[in-house]
């Protein structure tokens, strides 16, 4: 499975349960770890800080004791545990620490982790709320007229809305420049699509739409294979084909259509 | 202590400069103000720090106009690039200089960087299909105002179009829909008081012509190791190939 670096992590939990938020800051010798919550339309606010040397949480005034707890499974690793969740706990949680930078100054800047989105909901969802892909291949018109082709990767019926999509050529770890629409709500789930336009010379390469989502099967990135295409116009018989997914061997069916 | 960012959002074309205002209230005499950039992925990136007893801070394209008496600390981003589109937060730091200090944030200002003002460009329009799904791809147009209409007699559902800035500094758009009669769906686009149809771009070929998957080591005949498809594969016409994974 491929690795989508940084950003966009989510945790979905029902009310009255607990949640764990892992800090992804790689800091050695941090004396204090701060936890911030950012809710849409509000200013980010600190909830507490963790005194590393004394293994002690110091909460902001007005917060209920026992709600937050910093767990350290190993050295320089921190997990915020939230108990007795309510819907209003939803938001983006950041860990942060002061980076001294220049020793001459008493501090320089506060570094933030990449953030984890917590979604607290009691909605009854389908058992499988992983992104369901549909692929679109370039139109003949585009490849002929523009000497380029656009692949489109549609992802539907996923929850929560936190998703990350990128594109790579087969046998390459280079992330290709793609474009995407906003994540859209459809009933109780979400949909999103991403597209990649490649020059004619790249149309004979296999491309992968790689999707990171909390509910992907086995917790690994989903790889949707876009087969290489010939841009010369030819006639073909319908065939069944196989292609590899990151998790599965899937059947790709090619369909011949006549007028 | 309080931080106020009155601008909820601002838009500016590339190459220009944008100034983001931030007012704060504090009883401290000595303090620091920080500016952060929040990416769409929610990552929070430090940009620049302004000390209350320091000259106006400058770092690359970021500069701060600090007025201590007015308790104002404006961030200017010069020579804007498309990648500068993000939410920008102003934050006031406790004066203690201790590792326990917290930041007091404003609500943030969303910056949208637009393409440079330029001559109008007419879009190219292409239709892509898979089963009941139809996508209308509208490429390389300017200005942004556009109406995309998927023409069908049997609509199941349609989605709002995604309009994004293209790598070349114009706009691209995609509109998706689901239709019972996807084979007959066409796309028409209204832009700059003109109508452009996907049929204007169609290549006149035989109905059996295809954009065909190239045969590679990864596209082989099915064997017993192949799992059944996760979704039904329907036929379609324009890209002459339907793949549902």
């Amino acid at each position: 499975s491929s690795n989508l670096e940084g950003g966009t992590k989510s945790v979905t939990r029902p009310t009255r349960s607990s949640a764990e938020i892992t800090c992804d800051l790689t800091v050695i010798n941090a004396f204090y770890i701060h936890w911030y919550l950012h809710q849409e339309g509000k200013a980010p606010q600190r909830l507490l800080y963790y005194d590393v040397s004394n293994s002690k949480d110091v909460l902001e005034s007005g917060l209920s004791p026992g709600k937050y707890y910093t767990h350290t499974p190993r050295r320089w690793s921190w997990i915020l545990i939230l108990r007795n969740l309510i819907e209003n706990d939803s938001g983006v949680y950041y860990c942060a620490t002061w980076d001294r930078g220049n020793p001459k100054t008493h501090y320089y800047k506060k570094l933030f982790g990449s953030g984890t989105t917590l979604v607290v909901t009691d909605k009854q969802l389908d058992a499988d709320v992983s992104p369901k892909p549909t692929i679109f291949l370039p139109s003949i018109a585009e490849t002929k007229l523009q000497k380029a082709g656009t692949y489109l990767c549609l992802l539907e019926k996923f929850f929560p809305d936190v998703i990350k999509i990128h594109w790579q050529e087969k046998k390459s770890n280079t992330i290709l420049g793609s474009q995407e629409g906003n994540t859209m709500k459809t009933n109780d789930t979400y949909m999103k699509f991403s597209w990649l336009t490649v020059p004619e010379k790249s149309l004979d390469k296999e491309h992968r739409c790689i999707v990171r989502h909390e509910n992907n099967k086995n917790g690994v990135d989903q790889e949707i294979i876009f087969p290489p295409i010939k841009t010369d116009v030819i006639t073909m018989d319908p065939k069944d084909n196989c292609s590899k997914d990151a998790n599965d061997t899937l059947l790709l069916q090619l369909t011949n259509t006549s007028a | 202590q309080k931080v106020t960012q009155a601008q909820s959002s601002v838009s500016m074309p590339v190459r220009k400069a944008v100034t983001l205002n931030c007012l704060y209230e504090t009883s401290w005499w000595s303090y620091y103000i920080f500016w952060y950039k929040q990416l769409p992925s929610k990552e929070m990136i430090f940009l620049i720090r302004q000390g209350s007893d320091e000259q106006n801070a400058k770092s690359g394209r970021y500069s701060v106009n600090f007025k201590k008496a007015a308790k104002s600390v404006a961030l200017t981003i010069s020579a804007l690039q498309l990648e500068d589109s993000a939410k920008y937060f102003c934050a006031l730091g406790d004066p203690g200089g201790l590792n326990t200090d917290k930041l007091i944030f404003g609500k943030g200002t969303r910056v949208t960087v637009e393409p440079r003002s330029q001559p109008h460009t007419k879009p190219s329009v292409f239709v892509m299909k898979n089963g009941t799904n139809v996508a209308c791809l509208v490429k390389e147009f300017y200005p942004k105002d556009i109406r995309i209409n998927l023409v069908s007699s049997k609509k199941i559902t349609e989605f709002d179009p995604a309009i994004v800035i293209s790598p070349s500094g114009k706009y691209n758009a995609v509109k998706l829909g689901k239709y019972e009669d996807s084979n007959s769906v066409t796309c028409s686009v209204q832009h700059d008081n003109k109508t452009v149809h996907s049929t204007d771009f169609e290549v006149k070929t035989d109905s059996t012509d295809h954009v065909k998957p190239k045969e590679t080591e990864n596209t082989k005949q099915p064997s017993k190791s192949c799992h059944k498809p996760k979704a039904i594969v329907h036929t379609e016409k324009v890209n002459m190939m339907s793949l549902t994974v």
């Epitope: - | 590339v14 190459r15 440079r116 003002s117 001559p119 109008h120 007419k122 300017y142 500094g169 008081n193």
Partner: antibody
Framework: QVQLQQPGADLVRPGTSVKLSCKAS????????MHWVQQRPGQGLEWIGV????????NYNQKFKGKATLTVDTSSSTAYMQLSSLTSEDSAVYYC??????????????WGQGTTLTVSA | DVVMTQTPLTLSVTVGQPASISCKSS???????????LNWLLQRPGQSPKLLIY???KVESGVPDRFSGSGSGTDFTLKISRVEAEDLGLYYC?????????FGAGTKLELK
């Protein structure tokens, strides 16, 4: 004063490529767009494309896509146009012309003297 | 592409007399930003083109005030109030509202 200097003439063989230059002086090179215009013998003017030296943003006339490639070297304040797979049809005078930002009017207020390109075996 | 149609193709005038050249575009040159991007250029024999007028009616600095431009939408006119010998040459209209930028075929101004 503002000047756009172009070599007077160039003679090249069919099938080869040529890189025409346009050296700017007397103004801030990155503050103006640079356009290229073709004028065939006894004919009118035809716009080839434009480049913004500040970030190398380009836009081409579809007719010249694949034929012309625009680049800049900001260190020497020079704009270049490479023409490939040359044929006798490409024999023409090629002008560079600068324009202000689009919001300011985008008018071609300064022109080079033009390079006469002859493609001949 | 936007087609720019200039009339007449040749204009024979006497020095001191007025002259008028018309330029019609195949579609409106009004940009979404509210400006109309129509330029007039003069190319004297053996020289490169020179800007006379931009944004329909703005006269470029250094250009004599006997030159004026008018029009809107698709119809534009260049007027010379009193032609002088130095005004001879090819006059081009140029639209920069739509990509690709397009020139008129040119109007040759000659002395009677």
């Amino acid at each position: 004063q503002v000047q756009l200097q172009q070599p007077g003439a160039d003679l090249v063989r069919p099938g080869t490529s040529v890189k025409l230059s346009c050296k700017a002086s007397g103004y801030t090179f990155t503050s103006y767009w640079m356009h290229w215009v073709q004028q065939r013998p006894g004919q009118g003017l035809e716009w080839i494309g434009v480049i913004d030296p500040s970030d190398s943003y380009t836009n081409y006339n579809q007719k010249f896509k694949g034929k012309a490639t625009l680049t800049v070297d900001t260190s020497s304040s020079t704009a270049y146009m490479q023409l490939s797979s040359l044929t006798s049809e490409d024999s023409a005078v090629y002008y560079c012309a600068r324009s202000d930002d689009y919001d300011e009017g985008y008018f071609f207020d300064q022109w080079g003297q033009g390079t006469t390109l002859t493609v001949s075996a | 592409d936007v087609v720019m149609t200039q009339t007449p193709l040749t204009l024979s005038v006497t020095v001191g007399q007025p002259a008028s050249i018309s330029c019609k575009s195949s579609q409106s040159l009004l940009h979404s930003n509210g400006k109309t991007y129509l330029n007039w250029l003069l190319q004297r024999p053996g020289q490169s083109p020179k800007l006379l007028i931009y944004l329909v009616s703005k006269v470029e600095s250094g250009v004599p005030d006997r030159f004026s431009g008018s029009g809107s939408g698709t119809d534009f006119t260049l007027k010379i109030s009193r032609v002088e010998a130095e005004d001879l040459g090819l006059y081009y209209c140029l639209q920069v509202t739509h990509f690709p930028l397009t020139f008129g075929a040119g109007t040759k101004l000659e002395l009677k």
